[in-house]
């Protein structure tokens, strides 16, 4: 008997209501292997979730996010929402980074700006909400006949918190 | 598809060094957040701290500074989780996972056993 | 920082209504999520943002979180959700995140 089931192909499952004979998969529903006694019900792509590929009886839909939010999690299994540049997502929504902190995504979390004199250099363009700093030599570096090294990578106060 | 593949099992001596890894692929590894989680034998989960690969800043727990050291590098997506001198109280197993506050990536773990 | 207390052990049996607690400090004020592990496997989210479902999380699996308590509630529980479950938050405060510390739930006979 087991033999018969696995004859029944990808789309189809062994109905034990009908001598384990090869039924489709109903509607809505889908089998991706062959040999299934019963079919998967298909994803629906619903509320934040939009459909990237439709239900077959051989393979499951697919799911986007809706615009404005960004998919989370294996085949897309989770959306959340999106924020401008500059900002991060709480639980009453988009904040503006606080000031000395960036964020360059539209998704995560703002980080503070490099601390440039912790490596001994200066600001060389300010940081925006959007944006980190840019470090460049300190007045030493620039004096004649000093070193040409390789600047370390930039460092930041640990532990700063940007709320 | 996405994958965060952890370094393999280690065994140490109490006051010896490790530095374990978890190598990301299938998404833009840079800027998505790493944070590392404990989980001693038996016990729950505890966040450590996660780092931005992008920039590699990083941001601990208070329970953890000073204790560990977070680093990455972005070129070959890889994150590491370092001691540099064990207890036996380190003794757990450790995941990496993506994301700061909602984690939908995770490593396999890494045990480490720390014993004299 | 916010701590986040569960009870030890929930037991529930098969098909009736498992809840598990999760209280700090003005929790409702942040998001919750859920994540449910079994042994020898790492944790896998099941509720996000409070109540937020993953597809692919049956949906029996439903949460709320106001105040000082974040519920996740397993209606007509089957024996496959026998596992641990954590509660955990980001706070915008420590610029962290915590875990609560943990919850067995045993699905009886």
């Known amino acids: 008997l087991q033999d018969l089931c696995s004859n029944c192909p990808a789309g189809t499952f062994c109905d034990n209501n009908r001598s384990q004979i090869c039924s489709p998969c109903p509607p809505n529903s889908f089998s991706s292997a062959g040999g299934q006694r019963t079919c998967d019900i298909c994803r629906q792509c619903k509320g934040v979730f939009k459909t990237r590929k439709e239900c077959s009886s051989t393979s499951n839909a697919e799911c986007d996010c809706i615009s404005g939010y960004h998919c989370l999690g294996a085949e897309c299994s989770m959306c959340e929402q999106d924020c401008k540049q500059g900002q991060e997502l709480t639980k009453k929504g988009c904040k503006d980074c606080c000031f000395g902190t960036f964020n360059d995504q539209k998704r995560g979390i703002c980080r503070p700006w490099t601390n440039c004199s912790l490596d001994g250099k200066s600001v060389l363009v300010n940081g925006t909400k959007e944006r980190d700093v840019v470090c460049g030599p300190s007045p030493a570096d620039l004096s004649p006949g000093a070193s040409s090294a390789t600047p370390p990578a930039p460092a930041r106060e640990p532990g700063h918190s940007p709320q | 598809q996405v994958q965060l593949v952890q370094s393999g099992a280690e065994v140490k001596k109490p006051g010896e060094s490790l530095k374990i890894s978890c190598k990301g692929s299938?998404?833009?590894?840079?800027?998505?957040?790493i944070s590392w989680v404990r989980q001693m034998p038996g016990k729950g989960l505890e966040w450590m701290g996660k780092?931005?690969?992008?920039?590699?800043?990083?941001n601990y727990s208070p329970s953890f500074q000073g204790q560990v050291t977070i680093s990455a590098d972005k070129s070959i997506s890889t994150a590491y989780l370092q001691w540099s001198s064990l207890k036996a109280s380190d003794t757990a197993m450790y995941y990496c996972?993506?994301?700061?506050?909602?984690?939908?990536?995770w490593g396999q773990g890494t045990l480490v056993t720390v014993s004299s | 920082d916010i701590e986040l207390t569960q009870p030890p052990s929930v037991s529930v049996a098969p098909g009736q209504t498992a809840r598990i607690s999760c209280s700090g400090d003005?929790?409702?004020?942040?998001?919750a999520h859920w994540y449910q592990q079994k042994p020898g496997q790492a944790p896998v989210v099941v509720i996000y943002?409070?109540?937020n479902r993953p597809s692919g999380i049956p949906e029996r699996f439903s949460g709320s979180n106001s105040g000082n308590t974040a519920t996740l509630t397993i209606s007509g529980t089957q024996a496959e959700d026998e596992a641990d479950y954590y509660c955990?938050?980001?706070?915008?405060?420590?610029?962290?995140?915590?875990f609560g510390g943990g919850t067995k739930l045993t699905v009886l006979g």
């Open positions: 996972a993506r994301g700061y506050g909602i984690f939908d990536y």
């Open positions: 299938g998404y833009s590894f840079s800027t998505y957040w």
């Open positions: 780092i931005y690969p992008g920039d590699s800043y990083t």
């Open positions: 003005n929790i409702g004020d942040q998001y």
């Open positions: 943002q409070d109540k």
């Open positions: 955990s938050t980001y706070t915008f405060v420590g610029f962290t995140t915590v």
